[in-house]
């Protein structure tokens, strides 16, 4: 039959070449002389000439060694023709399978593999995967089947078997307890890949395992005891820098310190922050300290990390003894603002009040007083006793110096310390009203027609306060009542002036006396311009003559 079974040829054959593989034979050769040929890749097309055929005998020849990793299978066609070139058989398929030899070593995909694992993890934790390839066949033979192993580990601490590798996947896992970044931050493993499923050729690579930091070390104060001196009253004053050491990775959350005042700061006088570079705890005053109240504070400060501890760790505590230094403090007026009621217009020399200051310092310092600001110059202050007396007339109605009945004075106290210090107080004099002002009409000039005159309504004002104001009473004096009438309205806060007899055009003085509810009387002269006109007028028509 014109058929041939698949031909298996080992790669890397040593010859001699050409090497006879198989014979092509057509049974038509009994009738006529047959000539054989082959076509296809490896014969007459690239790679040409690998195979040939003996034209007359039909022997299939291999001309050179094969490489399975280059071409694993050749598909050729065999041809049989008669002497005249006529085809005597259909083309026959010839399959040549190149069988594998273990002629390649495994190759790692990288010279150096890098992986990482957290310190202190459980055995079994996966770290990384390494990969090696082998060009040889791994399907029908073990030539390309790679088995992984760890050849060596550096350093060998805490012992030489910290990692294991999955024989077939190349996954490296932790196998032992004791990974400690602070002792060994990095392991270098020499890994092997061996073909023939572990019984063949070996190649090596390096796997570097970085041990990542876990917060398994507590920050520790060094030193644990501090003494500091702070002037009293200083706010935001740096008291002390506290230093800690932490074996975890610098500038990581496991290293960065967090400080907490655990005790001794009952008055919430202190605060502590972390310096971003040095990691020190900076203890400062949040409020001023008072030497006279407490001259020594003992603080207890605990330190932890930004990151939580991965295990139960004892926290470090520092003790800071803060000595408060005495400072000459300013006298303080008690109260800082003093409100005193005093009648306006009291006689000169009359006492107003006593306003004194206290010195926070324990020594019996002498305090002297003086007035710092007295806008109207109405007061004097005794330098020794703090007695305030009137030296001018206190006038409630003085709008330049008095606001809302209050006259504001600033006083000063000075101690005899070295250097001396001063404190100020504010004296708020509430001036009690006295009926010292009579009612006044507004306006004090009017224009009125002498025929059918319009009544003139004048507003009454009184600088005093109730009850020294309305209801007001009005009275015309000096014969003004011959021509004029004056009546106060029902509310008692306006006066109506009316012309009751004809007056020729001219300017006249109307003498109006107004008195308040306390019978304080005030005489006012109203200038009345009478015009020749009817009803309402604002200015006289035409020229007018005085008289």
């Amino acid at each position: 039959d014109w058929v041939v079974a698949p031909i298996s040829v080992p790669e890397n054959g040593k010859g001699p070449f050409p090497q006879r593989l198989n014979q092509l034979k057509s049974n038509k050769d009994r009738d006529t002389k047959i000539f054989y040929s082959i076509t296809g890749p490896g014969a007459d097309s690239p790679p040409e000439g690998v195979f040939a055929v003996e034209k007359e005998t039909g022997w299939l020849l291999l001309n050179k060694p094969l490489d399975r990793e280059e071409i694993a299978k050749y598909e050729l066609f065999g041809h049989a023709v008669s002497e005249n070139g006529a085809s005597v058989e259909d083309p026959m398929n010839i399959s040549i399978i190149v069988t594998d030899q273990n002629d390649h070593k495994p190759k790692f995909t990288q010279d150096t593999f890098r992986g990482s694992v957290l310190e202190g993890v459980l055995p079994g934790t996966s770290v990384m995967q390494v990969t090696a390839t082998d060009e040889d066949d791994a399907i029908y033979t073990y030539n390309g089947v790679v088995a992984y192993s760890i050849h060596s580990q550096e350093p060998k601490d805490p012992h030489d078997l910290m990692f294991t590798i999955h024989r077939s996947t190349g996954t490296i896992s932790v196998i032992s307890s004791g990974l400690d970044r602070e002792k060994v931050p990095e392991y270098t493993l020499t890994i092997q890949a061996t073909d023939m499923d572990g019984d063949g050729s070996t190649t090596t690579a390096v796997a570097v395992v970085e041990i990542l930091d876990a917060n398994d070390n507590a920050p520790m104060f060094d030193p644990q005891k501090y003494e500091a001196h702070v002037p009293e009253n200083a706010v935001g004053h740096e008291v002390q820098r506290l230093t800690v050491t932490d074996l975890d990775a610098p500038n990581s959350p496991a290293w960065r310190a967090t400080y907490l005042i655990m005790g001794g700061d009952d008055g919430d006088h202190f605060t502590i922050t972390t310096h971003p570079e040095s990691n020190q705890g900076i203890l400062t005053t949040r409020k001023g300290l008072d030497f006279e109240a407490k001259n020594q504070h003992t603080l207890y400060v605990e330190v932890t990390n930004e990151a939580p501890f991965v295990l139960k760790l004892p926290t470090s505590t520092a003790t800071i003894v803060v000595h408060v230094e005495d400072v000459n403090e300013a006298p303080v007026f008690v109260p800082p603002s003093k409100v005193v009621e005093v009648q306006e217009g009291i006689p000169t020399g009359e006492p107003v009040c006593v306003y004194t200051a206290e010195d926070p310092d324990k020594e019996n310092q002498k305090i002297s007083y003086r007035i710092l600001r007295d806008p109207a110059g109405w007061l004097a202050m005794d330098p020794d006793s703090g007695q305030v007396t009137a030296v001018g007339t206190l006038d409630r109605e003085d709008e330049q110096f008095v606001r809302n009945n209050i006259y504001e004075v600033m006083v000063l106290a000075m101690d005899n310390g070295s250097p001396p210090t001063t404190g100020t107080g504010t004296l708020l004099l509430t001036l009690i009203d006295v009926n010292d002002h009579g009612p006044v009409p507004e306006p004090r000039q009017i224009t009125i027609c002498n025929q059918s005159p319009v009544r003139q309504v004048l507003n009454i004002t009184d600088k005093d306060l109730s009850p020294h104001t309305s209801p007001f009473q009005a009275q015309l004096t000096d014969d003004s009542d011959i021509y004029w009438t004056a009546e106060v309205n029902e509310e008692g806060d306006t006066v109506v002036l009316s012309l009751k007899k004809f007056l020729k055009q001219d300017t006249y003085d109307v003498h109006l006396s107004l008195s308040d509810h306390g019978n304080k009387e005030q005489l006012t002269v109203i200038r009345a311009t009478v015009c020749d006109c009817h009803g309402h007028v604002e200015t006289c028509p035409g020229p007018w003559k005085g008289g």
Partner: antibody, heavy 117, light 111 residues
């Protein structure tokens, strides 16, 4: 002499809780991962839980996940197993053992936990 | 992941040798050289007798030996003695999430 001594076992009703302790001596306790392994009456060994030397890493078998909590106090050289929501199938002798990753050694003498109404 | 497979029981006469097999997969026994064996007498705690396939801890008799081929590990006991009668458990390191597997146990009877 390396020694592990369990305690805390006893009879408890279903849904109840128990806390087992394992006191270690004779070795650097904090350097080793520790495990709890249990053995139901007449049955084989079952790995229950493990904890790393620092205590920062833990493992639980699916059968106890969410109910049991392993912990350790290295300052007291003691391993703990807090067992909540106990079931009848948790009845077993509970052993603590140092776990090197590849093997368990040494083992404690075991403490019996019986879950029954 | 199921337990490693061990025969439920084996027996032998004093002085004889016996072998207990422990079959796993290419992810446990076949993948790592971390097979260990434990002996447990009735009412007692397990005791490590072999680690890393064939390493004996100090104090363990050299009558106990171990081997591994492919996915199967074996424990051999030569010169059987009455005190060898016990339950034997194999264990293997494995890929997560379990990390460790136990065999179902083999009861050794010394006839």
């Amino acid at each position: 002499e390396v020694q592990l001594l369990e305690s805390g076992g006893g009879l408890v009703q279903p849904g109840g809780s128990l806390r087992l302790s394992c006191a270690a001596s004779g070795f650097t306790f904090s350097s080793y991962a520790m495990s709890w392994v249990r053995q139901a009456p007449g049955k084989g060994l079952e790995w229950v839980s493990a904890i790393s030397g620092s205590g920062g890493s833990t493992y639980y078998a699916d059968s106890v996940k969410g109910r049991f909590t392993i912990s350790r106090d290295n300052s007291k050289n003691t391993l703990y197993l807090q067992m909540n929501s106990l079931r009848a199938e948790d009845t077993a002798v509970y052993y603590c053992a140092s776990w090197g990753g590849g093997w368990f050694d040494p083992w404690g003498q075991g403490t019996m936990v019986t879950v029954s109404s | 992941q199921s337990a490693l497979t061990q025969p439920a029981s084996v027996s032998g006469s004093p002085g004889q040798s016996i072998t207990i097999s422990c079959t796993g997969t290419s992810n446990d026994v076949g993948a790592y050289n971390y097979v260990s064996w434990y002996q447990q007498h009735p009412g007692k705690a397990p005791k490590l007798i072999l680690s890393e396939v064939n390493k004996r801890p100090s104090g363990v008799s050299n009558r106990f030996s171990g081997s591994k081929s492919g996915n199967t590990a074996s424990l051999s006991i030569s010169g059987l003695q009455a005190e060898d009668e016990a339950d034997y458990y194999c264990s293997s390191f494995t890929s997560g999430p379990v990390f460790n597997l136990f065999g179902g146990g083999t009861k050794l009877t010394v006839l």
